[in-house]
Amino acid sequence: QNCSGPCRCPDEPAPRCPAGVSLVLDGCGCCRVCAKQLGELCTERDPCDPHKGLFCHFGSPANRKIGVCTAKDGAPCIFGGTVYRSGESFQSSCKYQCTCLDGAVGCMPLCSMDVRLPSPDCPFPRRVKLPGKCCEEWVCDEPKDQTVVGPALAAYRLEDTFGPDPTMIRANCLVQTTEWSACSKTCGMGISTRVTNDNASCRLEKQSRLCMVRPCEADLEENIKKGKKCIRTPKISKPIKFELSGCTSMKTYRAKFCGVCTDGRCCTPHRTTTLPVEFKCPDGEVMKKNMMFIKTCACHYNCPGDNDIFESLYYRKMYGDMA
């Protein structure tokens, strides 16, 4: 628990941290550990995530062994007449859990974003809103005719695939790969997932990649030409380095991003490709992550409903009004 003894680290390589969780040196400067998150217990050995402005709050000095990861006090967030303090979490609706961090709100979907592949017992899976339920659920439709139609439109159209055809049969295995899910963030670094059984054991596995639809700093609405409603693919600015949990990409990238619309449409990636990106961390650790790179974007009305201000803001307006 404390740093008085010699450094002793597990023999196996550094742990794999969940998405968005930083890999940091423990408080003793000995071993690499997954940083503790907001509200989790922390010790001298198990530090809080410094890249999220978290510190280990021990309470009274008499009990300086175990603390709770607490957000640094910062600017509040003000919505609908309610003032949320920095570090405070609140539910904007049954679908979103939001956190105020130094004046800015970040929201996570509470509804599962899982994907369901067609199977013999459920050849036509479809997500529907059931009465009295908050989140959409999967139902199995009987085919209306014999034409095989795939799962509902995903946010990304064409992934440049290298390798087997997504529906080829290989050694008693019907190889199936879903389309990549929409990026978990409408701006900044997020995660996109898909499900595939394209592996030696024909087992379903979840693959993930980093994605950035657009940087958060860009005020893209200002670049829309007079009379136009959308800016589909803004001009590529200077080459940038990507950041992930305090680590920086080793190369610079002249990446394409998607723009925004002012007429209620969503602007999302249309054609993408996946490439490995190497990140170098302050402690010298190098990690390689797959990342989505955008080729083209599309503007469309295939957006979630407007029944939730955060949902419509996140997916439809991006940075839109709540007025």
Partner: antibody, heavy 126, light 105 residues
């Protein structure tokens, strides 16, 4: 380029009210908070309050509670700060300052008052 | 909540200078620093303890731990002569220090 342009100097009598405006340009007005900060002659900075220009929600410093009202007009990208029951110690330069973007993923926000207006001098004198 | 700064600090051109700001458990809060030249509006130079907005020279850096936040200017230039204010949030209210007048000799 991002600009905040404030209204001109005001001279008021004690007990009166003053309404200062701050017109924003060069960015999406409803996407960023706006703060009001004042500075008495030869003194330091004093935070008065904050407004969310999107929904119009506000939060004021306790010292100014009941005396200050912050509003906004999204059609003109303008925020207003009205201070009532003026006294001589309210003589100061009043600044509007753009705050954090309302929504952004952790680590990608510029959290601070990053753009300031030129200031409006309010003199309270009988 | 009170933030305490030294009223004045002086430095020779090219030297490194540090301006401190102390407050109860300040290390548990985000600290920002603002520069204000005479007759001008304030400029944000450091936010979230250590971050520098674009356009602010690399010679400006910040740190914050314990009860003290520090603004450090390395290779100080004549144009850095100004008042510097630290700022932090407590109970949803922003507080500024009284300011430090930096003189470049």
């Amino acid at each position: 380029e991002v600009h905040l342009v404030e209204s001109g100097a005001e001279v008021k009598k004690p007990g009166a009210s003053v309404k200062v405006s701050c017109k924003a340009s060069g960015y999406t007005f409803t996407s960023y908070y706006m703060h009001w900060v004042r500075q008495a002659p030869g003194q330091g900075l004093e935070w008065m309050g904050i407004i969310n220009p999107s929904g119009g929600s506000t939060s004021y410093a306790q010292k100014f509670q009941g005396r200050v009202t912050m509003t906004r007009d999204t059609s003109t990208s303008t925020v207003y700060m009205e201070l009532s029951s003026l006294r001589s110690e309210d003589t100061a330069v009043y600044y509007c300052a753009r705050g954090t973007r309302l929504y952004c993923s952790g680590g990608s926000c510029l959290n601070g008052m990053d753009v300031w207006g030129q200031g409006t001098t309010v003199t309270v004198s009988s | 909540y009170v933030l305490t700064q030294p009223p004045s600090v002086s430095v020779s051109p090219g030297q490194t200078v540090s301006i401190t700001c102390s407050g109860d458990k300040l290390g548990n809060k985000y600290a920002s620093w603002y520069q204000q030249r005479p007759g001008q509006s304030p400029i944000l130079v450091i936010y979230q303890d250590t971050k520098r907005p674009s356009g602010i020279p690399e010679r400006f850096s910040g740190s914050n731990s314990g009860n003290t936040a520090t603004l450090t200017i390395s290779g100080t230039q004549a144009m850095d002569e100004a008042d510097y204010y630290c700022q932090a949030w407590d109970s949803n209210t922003a507080f500024f220090g009284a300011g430090t007048q930096l003189t470049v000799l």
